[in-house]
Interface confidence: low
């Protein structure tokens, strides 16, 4: 067992670790979500730029200082292009999110074009259809019961949207969606201790060829991709969606990460690599947006004044556009966009942010030198709730995102999508599908707390992402009944 004097020897302050778990006992035992634990660690040393912590037995650096974060994520990105998640590249491991720096460059160059404005506009009508079906479903349910658990409800919408936009699949019945959701949900909700194993013995999962993903999930994506490849006869179909891009890559056979295209840095596009990308798009496209929308609805239920302002904005914009929600109207709704940004400040879904040093690196403005392969962590949640950057941080206040207010803040004080070159590739897609759905909801319903609304909402400790423990229960009141 490695000793816990690594940071002491380097004069880096940090919390006292406990045997075996380091500073992650609560998250390793699934008592608290990892993001919450990191926020607590962030808060322990308010005067420090960096904090020395132990993930299980591995020393890691938690960075608090925003200027240092800017160096790591942007200025010195080439040192930190790896996320430092080491497990088998088989079985979904070579996906865009978890890939090492080189693999990520190879894939990222290819996938960025999926999310251009033109492509998003093409996807918008598919999102629209999904949102309309969703509203019909809510309206029908409302006749029986006005109380909803919105987190799982919204997952059915985002599941449809990502399925349609990325894979050209239509889930006709709620039942089909439930089946797919429950399989995919396993990856997020079933506690796998592989991550902790990796923290204790970095590289072990890779050496033993172990994955962090359950076999049932791997098989689901394999059959999904096989079916679509067969449907499209192995060739792009002209839909210009995610799957077409994948099929183009499949025809190429490999992608290269460096600008000269040398075969030394090329990635072979096997069916396994294709499955891995399908998987990450599915997960990233459905869970993150569903959770963000659920939290936004929760805050609107608790803040009726803000909800009234949003409803007024939605009504005004829809009236000016013959009742239609378009790609442009969604962008036009300034207050709606600010409320979305504020939701992500309070509930940043991916926590913590993680990078790995690819060489020894001196932390700017300090005497600390971190060794090659050290994991560096950033707590968006810690930053987003730091009163240094946000007054009264527990209060939901969209006005924080007035252009003037944003201009006053450090560019690294807001990190829901990460930062720099390796930020969230799908953030515009996520925003679009979320705001479209919220617009549709507010045009038809007023959201109110129900008798079961938990006003002291906790973070689910078992999930890898931030999410509401026990779901979010609110009432959806048809507006015709209200007015």
């Amino acid at each position: 067992m490695r000793t816990f004097n690594y940071w002491k020897k380097r004069n880096v302050r940090g919390p006292e670790p406990v045997v075996f778990f380091g500073n992650l006992k609560d998250s390793a035992l699934r008592k608290k979500n990892m993001g919450v634990v990191m926020e607590e660690l962030y808060n322990m040393f308010p005067e420090e730029k960096v904090i020395g912590i132990y993930r299980m037995t591995s020393p890691c650096l938690l960075v608090r200082d925003l200027d240092v974060i800017k160096h790591i994520m942007i200025k010195d990105f080439e040192v930190f292009s790896d996320r430092g998640v080491e497990f088998s590249k088989e079985g979904l491991g070579s996906n865009l999110f978890h890939a090492d720096g080189e693999t990520w460059r190879a894939l990222g160059n290819r996938f960025t074009p999926i999310f251009t404005s033109g492509k998003l506009k093409n996807m918008f009508y598919l999102m629209h259809e999904g949102a309309d079906n969703f509203i019909d479903h809510v309206s029908a349910e409302c006749e029986k019961n006005q109380e909803f658990e919105v987190h799982s409800l919204l997952q059915t919408y985002t599941m449809s949207t990502i399925a349609a936009c990325a894979f050209g699949i239509s889930y006709d019945s709620i039942g089909d969606k439930v089946k797919a959701l429950d399989i995919v949900d396993k990856i997020i909700s079933e506690p796998s201790y592989a991550i902790e194993l990796d923290m204790m013995y970095p590289g072990l999962l890779s050496k033993l060829n172990l994955s962090i993903f359950p076999t049932v999930v791997k098989n689901f994506f394999k059959s999904l991709v096989d079916n679509i490849v067969a449907q499209r006869n192995g060739k792009p179909s002209g839909r210009n969606d995610f799957m077409d891009l994948i099929l183009e890559l499949r025809q190429l056979g490999e992608v290269t990460s460096n600008k000269y295209g040398s075969s030394a840095s090329s990635l072979e596009i096997t069916d396994e690599v294709i499955c891995a990308q399908a998987f990450v798009f599915y997960i990233a496209g459905y869970e993150t947006s569903a959770t963000t929308m659920a939290y936004m609805i929760y805050q609107l239920a608790l803040n009726p004044d803000i909800q009234n302002k949003l409803i007024a904005e939605v009504d005004e914009v829809l009236k000016a556009n013959d009742g239609k929600v378009t790609y442009d109207t969604v962008k036009e709704m300034k207050y709606l966009n600010k409320a979305f940004d504020e939701t992500l400040r309070m509930y940043s879904i991916v926590e913590p942010l993680q990078r790995k040093a690819t060489r020894d690196y001196k932390i700017p403005g300090t005497d600390v030198v971190i060794e090659k392969d050290t994991i560096v962590l950033i707590s968006p949640r810690g930053i987003h709730y730091d009163p240094k950057y946000y007054d009264n941080p527990k209060q939901f206040n969209p006005d924080r995102f007035d252009a003037e207010e944003v201009g006053k803040r450090h560019p690294c004080a807001y990190l829901p999508f990460g930062l720099g070159q390796r930020n969230c590739i799908g953030m515009r897609f996520g925003r679009l599908q979320s705001l479209l759905c919220i617009t549709k909801i507010l045009s038809k319903f007023r959201i109110e707390p129900s008798k079961n609304t938990d006003r002291n909402l906790q973070v689910e400790p078992h999930r890898g992402l931030i999410g509401p423990k026990g779901g979010i229960r609110v009432n959806a009141i048809p507006r015709k009944l209200v007015s």
């Epitope: 479903h137 349910e141 909803f148 658990e149 709620i174 089946k179 997020i188 079933e190 079961n452 689910e460």
Partner: nanobody, 119 residues
């Protein structure tokens, strides 16, 4: 269709405990969560707890939080409700129900099992 069958009710002394079972059969893949309700004589039916099949998310109503424990056995398609420190006020017919994802409307119900707490 999802069929639900409760069992485990009966007469118990105050302070005692009880474990109710609910076995689900039929198209259980359609069911997202299972819940327990109770209805005391002359009162409305009250939702006491529910649990999601997929990730085990649990919810309890405030009135029962500390004494009731809901759990599931996916392999047996069975949900349990354990009740400790029973009080006369817990006397009711206990119903098991199942709901689809994304709504709190329970669409399938069991017949109910009587629990009577009395000395």
């Amino acid at each position: 269709q999802v069929q639900l069958q409760e069992s485990g009710g009966g007469l118990v002394q105050p302070g005692g405990s009880l474990r109710l079972s609910c076995a689900a059969s039929g198209r259980t893949s359609r069911s997202y969560a299972m819940g327990w309700f109770r209805q005391a004589p002359g009162k409305e039916r009250e939702h006491v707890a529910d649990i999601a099949w997929s990730d085990g998310r649990i919810y309890y109503s405030d009135s029962v939080k500390d004494r009731f424990t809901i759990s599931r056995d996916n392999a047996k398609n069975t949900v349990y409700l354990e009740i400790d420190s029973l009080k006369p006020g817990d006397t009711a017919v206990y119903y098991c129900a199942s709901r689809a994802r994304g709504t709190v409307s329970y669409n399938y119900w069991g017949q109910g099992t009587q629990v009577t707490v009395s000395s």
